[in-house]
């Protein structure tokens, strides 16, 4: 299709060299409230559209996203050539950042109602560039997090170290939806609640004598518990003794529950006492069996074939740790009578 | 930090509700209210605890149960209710926060109560 | 229910010296044990969680340990502002039941 009608936004995307972020694109195509965009050269004022443009069908999963090849060929379909690039509905997600994203990315409808909605696309022409001003050290993370219940703020990242006076006017959006209440290089959030949860993306324009273009970050917020002043509780087993027939194959699970920590290191192994000696155990990799915001719990299984008298005078020791310290269970085998 | 209101000089067979209030935090699913109580020169006497607001997950001494109702009525503000009064109930009624209670299989897991509030005295005389 | 018993219920001890306080539950309540200091006209302020984990801030003069149905509490180089009342709280139990109780008190009276 013909993409010279469609409208055109430039946008940088400065990344960090130094840590893992995203970007996005939005598909804006004009909503009818704003804008008959995608009538404008079809139709003089007085002429009346049949129907809507494609917007007002508030069907924002129906578009499809083209990539224009710099040498001239055809437009290429995103999903089919680029699996770095995610859609979601009408959002495009760029999973990691380079220079390589650079480049024009189409977007349009997928159902064209009308020979007038062959010209509803927009057309971005995306810039990708490392970061290279040492001057800003302590720049905003592109993953931030926040406290549950406290106060708190997100901060744009290509901005945040600018003074809010220095600060141009910011467009927020978060889960690809228009905050349109904000306009600083910060959010401030009084209180806390996990609904804060989400991708924002920050916006502001940056010209020069020739053009100007709209400067974009992409913030990953989690809200999160503080960490925990806790060692991990062993959940399972709760008692030191265990009843079991000897020769028959017997199976014990460690079930540890640990708080939420940032720098998450859980340890829980297996090792077995006999008089003087002691020794880790190989055992199964250990599985996560629940997580929630506040905590996780992890079990690890020790697998004996069989059970033999030697192993009834041995303790098999549950051992757990995080950054706060240590617990153990021990377990002694008794054989089953009768 | 919390901050108990509520306290008053009331009659035998009265009733009255005792409020919490916090500031700084609010009562999210990670914690759990409590309320303990402290007759005039005797030990601490823990009386129940709720942690996320629906009356079912309340929980309580025994001999507070029936007579004693927690409820959490904001995500800052959480009662304790008291009917049927008697002299035995004149104490400083504390609120405070355990930083971390959970369930497993049957079995509840506290931690300790690391916030306080300063207490709200409660008479009961005729 | 689960019933915390303290000894004793009172203790005299010198500044520098060191004082143990014992408590005691009817019933094994593993390592879920909490430690309070009380000073007159305030409220308590928890020191120990888990019968050995020191709150951030509590000086590491203060120890707990025991686990089951004994637990202690040491407080060595002792100083007048230790000079209060400490209560353990059992911190485990049956859903539903009355656990979360508090032993009786110990007076830390400071010379």
């Known amino acids: 299709f013909n993409i010279s009608g469609c409208s055109t936004k430039k946008l940088l995307w400065t990344y960090s060299t130094r840590s893992e972020e995203e970007f996005v694109l939005f598909c804006d195509l004009p909503e009818p409230q704003k804008s008959h965009f995608c009538h404008r050269n079809r139709l003089s004022p007085k002429q009346v559209p049949e129907h809507l443009p494609f917007m007002g069908s508030n069907d924002l999963s129906d578009v499809q996203w083209y990539q224009q090849p710099s040498n001239g060929d055809p437009l290429e379909d995103i999903r089919k050539s680029y699996p770095h690039i995610i859609q979601d509905k009408c959002t495009l997600h760029f999973l990691t950042p380079g220079v390589n994203n650079s480049g024009s990315y189409i977007c349009r409808p997928k159902m064209i109602k009308s020979p007038y909605d062959v010209a509803c696309c927009v057309k971005m022409i995306l810039e990708v560039k490392p970061q290279t001003n040492a001057s800003c050290e302590y720049s905003a993370s592109h993953k931030q997090d926040l406290l549950l219940g406290s106060t708190g703020s997100i901060s744009c990242p290509s901005l945040s170290c600018q003074s809010d006076a220095q600060s141009p006017a910011v467009t927020w959006y978060k889960n690809g939806k228009l905050l349109s209440v904000e306009r600083s290089n910060r959010i401030v959030v009084d209180e806390v609640y996990d609904y804060h949860q989400g991708t924002y993306v920050c916006d502001y324009t940056q010209s020069d004598t020739v053009s100007s273009w709209t400067v974009r970050a992409v913030v990953q917020v989690r809200t999160i518990v503080g960490d925990t002043k806790l060692k991990p509780d062993i959940l399972d087993p709760v008692e030191d003794t265990l009843e079991v027939e000897l020769g028959k194959p017997l199976t014990i699970s460690c079930k540890a529950r640990f708080g939420f920590e940032r720098v998450f290191n859980p340890v829980i192994k297996w090792y077995i006492k006999d008089s003087d000696l002691e020794w880790e155990v190989s055992v199964p990799e250990a599985k996560s069996i629940k997580s929630t915001l506040k905590d996780e719990i992890i079990e690890r299984n020790i697998i004996l074939e069989k059970v033999t008298q030697r192993d009834l005078r041995r303790k098999f020791v549950c051992f757990v740790q995080n950054s706060i310290g240590n617990t153990t269970q021990s377990v002694q085998l008794k054989e089953k009578r009768g | 930090s919390l901050e108990e209101s509520g306290g008053d000089l009331v009659k035998p067979g009265a009733s009255l509700t005792l409020t919490c209030t916090a500031s700084g935090f609010s009562f999210s699913s990670s914690y759990c209210m409590c309320w303990v109580r402290q007759a005039p020169g005797k030990g601490l006497e823990w009386i129940g605890c709720?942690?996320?607001?629906?009356?079912?997950?309340a929980y309580y001494a025994t001999w507070a149960k029936g007579r004693f109702t927690i409820s959490k009525t904001s995500s800052t503000t959480v009662t304790l209710q008291m009917t049927s009064l008697t002299a035995a109930d004149t104490a400083t009624y504390f609120c405070a926060r355990d930083y971390d209670t959970y369930d497993y299989d049957g079995y509840t897991y506290a931690a300790g109560f690391d916030l306080w509030g300063p207490g709200t005295l409660v008479t009961v005389s005729t | 229910d689960v019933v915390m018993t303290q000894t004793p219920a009172s203790v005299e001890a010198d500044v520098g010296g060191t004082v143990t306080i014992k408590c005691q539950a009817s019933q094994s309540i593993r390592s879920y044990l909490a430690w309070y200091q009380q000073k007159p006209g305030q409220p308590p302020k928890v020191l120990i969680y888990r019968a050995s984990t020191l709150e951030s801030g509590v000086p590491s003069r203060f120890k707990g340990s025991g686990s089951g149905t004994q637990f202690t509490l040491t407080i060595s180089d002792l100083e007048c502002a230790d000079a209060a009342t400490y209560y353990c709280?059992?911190?485990?139990?049956?859903?539903?039941?009355?656990?979360?109780?508090f032993g009786g008190g110990t007076e830390v009276v400071v010379k």
């Open positions: 709280q059992c911190t485990y139990g049956s859903s539903g039941s009355s656990f979360l109780a």
């Open positions: 709720i942690y996320d607001g629906s009356s079912d997950s």
